[in-house]
Amino acid sequence: ATKLTEEKYELKEGQTLDVKCDYTLEKFAASQKAWQIIRDGEMPKTLACTERPSKNSHPVQVGRIILEDYHDHGLLRVRMVNLQVEDSGLYQCVIYQPPKEPHMLFDRIRLVVTKGFSGTPGSNENSTQNVYKIPPTTTKALCPLYTSPRTVTQAPPKSTADVSTPDSEINLTNVTDIIREQKLISEEDLEQKLISEEDLHHHHHH
């Protein structure tokens, strides 16, 4: 299987993480997608998910997390605004494909949020007090409980199987964007043999 990698991002409290999860293939466009946190020794926990089927360009808000799926470009946009120190952790996007296990997207993000705000290069240092305006069409989707027969043997765990509903909702405020892309991991290729080995490297981060 493709080796999962992590990218570390160090942000200040109040900043915004803006992630583009690249799912690439049309067959995934309508699939429900989720943003998960992976805590050491635990299974991934779903913090937010799109609707099922996932709607095009239709923001879904769960607390300070906004998901927006752009079918025409194969991109899931994930924004975590007004970051807090306690948001630090390992995150990933997945695509739900029940009854199969979710398809993981990579690279995973190791987010480290530290106290105090200092503008990053290219950021707007005066935007700390700006209220993040959620589009009026924003909705909240219910995320499925997904249980897997797999056993977690790695640390940190790399299973994408077990997810649960979000347990907190927090206030929204905006600041600086840190932009990052993620690409499709080819677990689906291995399970269904749908894409040849020749294709696999094209889905990886260059």
């Epitope: 690439t24 293939l25 049309e26 067959k27 040849s196 094209h202």
Partner: antibody, heavy 121, light 111 residues
Framework: EVQLVESGGGLVQPGGSLKLSCAAS????????MHWVRQASGKGLEWVGR??????????YYAASVKGRFTISRDDSKNTAYLQMNSLKTEDTAVYYC????????????WGQGTLVTVSS | DIVLTQSPDSLAVSLGERATINCRAS??????????LHWYQQKPGQPPKLLIY???NLESGVPDRFSGSGSGTDFTLTISSLQAEDVAVYYC?????????FGQGTKLEIK
């Protein structure tokens, strides 16, 4: 190994019709959109059109120069894409390439060798 | 339609020297921070070959003397040290909007 092989080119009179085929192998054909690109002798590349996958209801898109005259289709069971060309004009004379992208609006990583279509009286 | 204009139309560079080709779009080819702009190399009698995708990503197997940069409407393909086998026509292409479009091509020769 991914392979795309075009066929069906040849000489046709103005106003005539021709159907090109693109036989694909080495990958899961149904997963990807397929495109046609053409190139007149000594000229640049011109995108002709694309056909998306079943997930997108086989939606098709065309360049303005061929819209209404050309039709792209596919048969996933035969791993083949087609370009039906009607009301051909002399300016349609070109090498026609079949190409496969790497996903939604992604780059053309694989190309066939092309098939020559000559429209002349 | 998005029009891609390459400059120059032709370019002669000495072996080992840097070659730079520009591509300007009539409107942005970006969606978020992704630039849906790609570069291809074509040699006589051959189909095009992908060099760079999404503005700056080097295609697997392509020598690292090739690089791409830019975003929005202005993009550049750079060959850091021209080799004899780099003589070809180079095309930029956008896939951000239908219809997809190509630049008119830049012919690269050795001085």
């Amino acid at each position: 190994e991914v392979q795309l092989v075009e066929s069906g080119g040849g000489l046709v009179q103005p106003g005539g019709s021709l159907k090109l085929s693109c036989a694909a192998s080495g990958f899961t054909f149904s997963t990807y959109a397929m495109h046609w690109v053409r190139q007149a002798s000594g000229k640049g590349l011109e995108w002709v059109g694309r056909i998306r996958t079943k997930s997108s209801n086989y939606a098709t898109y065309y360049a303005a120069s061929v819209k209404g005259r050309f039709t792209i289709s596919r048969d996933d069971s035969k791993n083949t894409a087609y370009l039906q060309m009607n009301s051909l004009k002399t300016e349609d004379t070109a090498v026609y390439y079949c190409t496969r992208d790497m996903g939604i609006r992604r780059q053309f990583a694989y190309w066939g060798q092309g098939t020559l279509v000559t429209v002349s009286s | 339609d998005i029009v891609l204009t390459q400059s120059p139309d032709s370019l002669a560079v000495s072996l080992g020297e840097r070659a730079t080709i520009n591509c300007r779009a009539s409107e942005s080819v970006d969606t978020f921070d992704y630039s849906f702009l790609h570069w291809y190399q074509q040699k006589p009698g051959q189909p095009p070959k992908l060099l760079i995708y999404r503005a700056s990503n080097l295609e697997s197997g392509v020598p690292d003397r090739f690089s791409g940069s830019g975003s929005g409407t202005d993009f550049t393909l750079t060959i850091s040290s021209l080799q004899a086998e780099d003589v070809a026509v180079y095309y930029c292409q956008q896939s951000n909007e239908d219809p997809y479009t190509f630049g008119q091509g830049t012919k690269l020769e050795i001085k």
